[in-house]
Interface confidence: low
């Protein structure tokens, strides 16, 4: 019989290389049975994991698994670092392995995106 415990399927030592200025969705795969757990994201700062309170998140439901998504709109250079999702379920706290974002800053802060880039990647404008 399949376990009805909540499980978080972030692989150990998983990592993503992403570009500053691009949009990005960091997925926390969540398996649950009847009631969807309360899931949060945090960012590691040394040995503590700082809860990300004012960030855009959403759920994506699929047939056999759900994803709790942390949105980067767009990715900023200081988004570099390790993240963890955790679920509260029946008074238990379940924590995922950490996943690391390696952010490449494609432009120095003083450079503005070109008109071509703004047309093809309007999120570079933030608006």
């Amino acid at each position: 019989k399949e376990s009805c415990d909540v499980q978080l399927y972030i692989k150990r030592q998983s990592e993503h290389s992403i570009l500053a200025g691009d949009p990005f969705e960091l997925e926390c795969p969540v398996k649950y049975c009847a009631n969807r757990p309360h899931v949060t994201w945090c960012k590691l700062n040394g040995t503590t994991c700082v809860k990300l309170e004012d960030r855009q998140t959403s759920w994506k439901e699929e047939k056999n698994i759900s994803f709790f998504i942390l949105h980067f709109e767009p990715v900023l250079p200081n988004d570099n670092g390790s993240y963890r999702c955790s679920a509260n379920f029946q008074s238990n706290l379940i924590e995922s392995h950490s996943t690391t974002l390696y952010v490449t800053d494609v432009k120095s802060a003083s450079e503005r995106p070109s008109k071509d880039e703004m047309a093809s990647r309007p999120w570079l404008l933030y608006r």
Epitope: P23, D54, R55, Q56, S58, H71, E73, P74, L76, D79, A119, S120, P122, W123, L125, Y126, R127
Partner: antibody, heavy 120, light 112 residues
Framework: QVQLRESGPGLVAPSQSLSITCTVS????????VSWVRQPPGKGLEWLGV???????NYHSVVISRLTINKDNSKSQVFLKLNSLQTDDTATYYC??????????????WGQGTSVTVSS | DIVMSQSPSSLAVSIGEQVTMSCKSS????????????LAWYQQRPGQSPKLLIY???TRESGVPDRFTGSGSGTDFTLTISSVQAEDLAVYYC????????FGGGTRLEIK
């Protein structure tokens, strides 16, 4: 210049489906998102959903089970399909060009709207 | 969903007067990452489609007269029209895009 034009059936019977086409010009559907917003008679605006340049969609939780938005980039057309209509779906339906990213965006150009009445 | 509340629901002013209207959100619309408030204001004149006036709470859309000013941060926002003109007769809606968009109920501006 940027233009959007909605075309719909006008009258739809309860429990039937509503299909509206938004034909755009002056910008590429590969690059920009298009949102659908409706306005019941004498009431306020309600965002329904969006299709982005890459084809991804987001839907309002109230209509997610009944709404499908897709598009044909080559024809510069965006399509709304809303199933199982009830009388409270009677509204003017607008399409609007979206500028920005998935969360931080504004609707900077709007169509003139198409009026839809749900009645037998 | 984030709930947007606008007040008053309607108000009447004379030409040339200043008017302010309020918009409150059920949670903060300020992103600590981008330091922007994801709030926009739209104007809908009678029988017309909505028109974007303000985004990021205070940035005027191009072509919008400078008598329109948006202000506020976090959960409390204000749209001010410094000297009302006859063509400002409209309903004004605020909209958050911090999460999937929701509109306020609107403020109807009437001319005395």
């Amino acid at each position: 210049q940027v233009q959007l034009r909605e075309s719909g059936p006008g009258l739809v019977a309860p429990s039937q489906s509503l299909s509206i086409t938004c034909t755009v010009s002056g910008f590429s559907l590969n690059t920009y998102g298009v949102s659908w917003v409706r306005q019941p008679p004498g009431k306020g605006l309600e965002w329904l959903g969006v299709v982005w340049g890459d084809g991804n969609t987001n839907y309002h939780s109230v209509v997610i089970s009944r709404l499908t938005i897709n598009k044909d980039n080559s024809k510069s057309q965006v399509f709304l399909k809303l199933n199982s209509l009830q009388t409270d779906d009677t509204a003017t339906y607008y399409c609007a060009k979206c500028y920005g990213s998935r969360f931080d965006y504004a609707m900077d150009y709007w169509g003139q709207g198409t009026s839809v009445t749900v009645s037998s | 969903d984030i709930v947007m509340s606008q007040s008053p629901s309607s108000l009447a002013v004379s030409i040339g007067e200043q008017v302010t209207m309020s918009c409150k959100s059920s949670q903060s619309l300020l992103s600590s990452r981008t330091r922007k408030n994801y709030l926009a204001w739209y104007q809908q004149r009678p029988g017309q489609s909505p028109k974007l006036l303000i985004y990021w709470a205070s940035t005027r859309e191009s072509g919008v007269p400078d008598r329109f000013t948006g202000s506020g941060s976090g959960t409390d926002f204000t749209l001010t029209i410094s000297s009302v003109q006859a063509e400002d007769l409209a309903v004004y809606y605020c909209k958050q895009s911090y999460n999937l968009p929701t509109f306020g109920g609107g403020t109807r501006l009437e001319i005395k």
